[in-house]
């Protein structure tokens, strides 16, 4: 396993609809044709997998149908979007990139993006 640099933004604020987007960029050390991207969430020293996708270079990034993540790839950067976020989902979201094929295998883990999610205030009842 060889190490690889990964960059991602330090902080992102989710929209009022609970959507957060960020870029994950990796320093590809060679001609990888198969790449796996995983988003991990770290909160209270617990790390959980949020979503993962494997893609072939030049093809679309596809997550599972029930995934809360969507994304697009362009060269050695991936644009990730996480949906359905609530205030309790605030945490550090880490981008993990693996160059699966051809060998050698490379692994890169970003420093994480702190995503802040604020639940919208309910609209007050109007008297009309």
């Amino acid at each position: 396993c060889k190490a690889m640099h990964v960059a991602q933004p330090a902080v992102v604020l989710a929209s009022s609809r609970g959507i957060a987007s960020f870029v994950c960029e990796y320093a590809s050390p060679g001609k990888a044709t198969e790449v796996r991207v995983t988003v991990l969430r770290q909160a209270d020293s617990q790390v959980t997998e949020v979503c993962a996708a494997t893609y072939m270079m030049g093809n679309e990034l596809t997550f599972l149908d029930d995934s809360i993540c969507t994304g697009t790839s362009s060269g050695n950067q991936v644009n990730l979007t996480i949906q359905g976020l609530r205030a309790m989902d605030t945490g550090l979201y880490i981008c993990k990139v693996e160059l699966m094929y051809p060998p050698p295998y490379y692994l890169g883990i970003g420093n994480g993006t702190q995503i802040y999610v604020i639940d919208p205030e309910p609209c007050p009842d109007s008297d009309f």
Partner: nanobody
Framework: EVQLVESGGGLVQPGGSLRLSCAAS????????VGWFRQAPGKEREELAC????????DYPGSVKGRFTISRDNAKNTVYLQMNSLRAEDTAVYYC???????????????????WGQGTQVTVSS
């Protein structure tokens, strides 16, 4: 859209040095990571070096590490490849390529670059 033009190639004796330039027009190069590649007749394109947007991140394959150095001058919209201790097997057409990125990294994979120059010939011979 950015356009790239390489220069600085030519005939050099074994053991000699050359500095190649990759000049950009049509856009500011500081938005792009830049890579240098070469292709010898009948061979696959080979990665040589890359440099991130700010110049703080560079990467080289083991084959040229220590002999080749990449640098950039964003004020001049130019990226350079300094090549030392040249050998006959360094004879090839040398290309630079650019990729618009968000952060400071770069890639050694030709698959990641979408803008390429026309190339400059380097011949190492006595």
């Amino acid at each position: 859209e950015v356009q790239l033009v390489e220069s600085g190639g030519g005939l050099v004796q074994p053991g000699g040095s050359l500095r190649l330039s990759c000049a950009a027009s049509g856009d500011t190069l500081e938005s792009f990571a830049v890579g240098w590649f070469r292709q010898a007749p009948g061979k696959e394109r080979e990665e040589l070096a890359c440099i991130g947007r700010t110049g703080e991140f560079t990467d080289y394959p083991g084959s040229v590490k220590g002999r080749f150095t990449i640098s950039r001058d964003n004020a001049k919209n130019t990226v350079y490849l300094q090549m030392n201790s040249l050998r006959a097997e360094d004879t090839a057409v040398y290309y630079c390529a650019a990729e618009r990125l968000v952060f400071h990294l770069c890639s050694l994979s030709e698959y990641d670059y979408d803008t390429w120059g026309q190339g400059t010939q380097v011949t190492v011979s006595s």
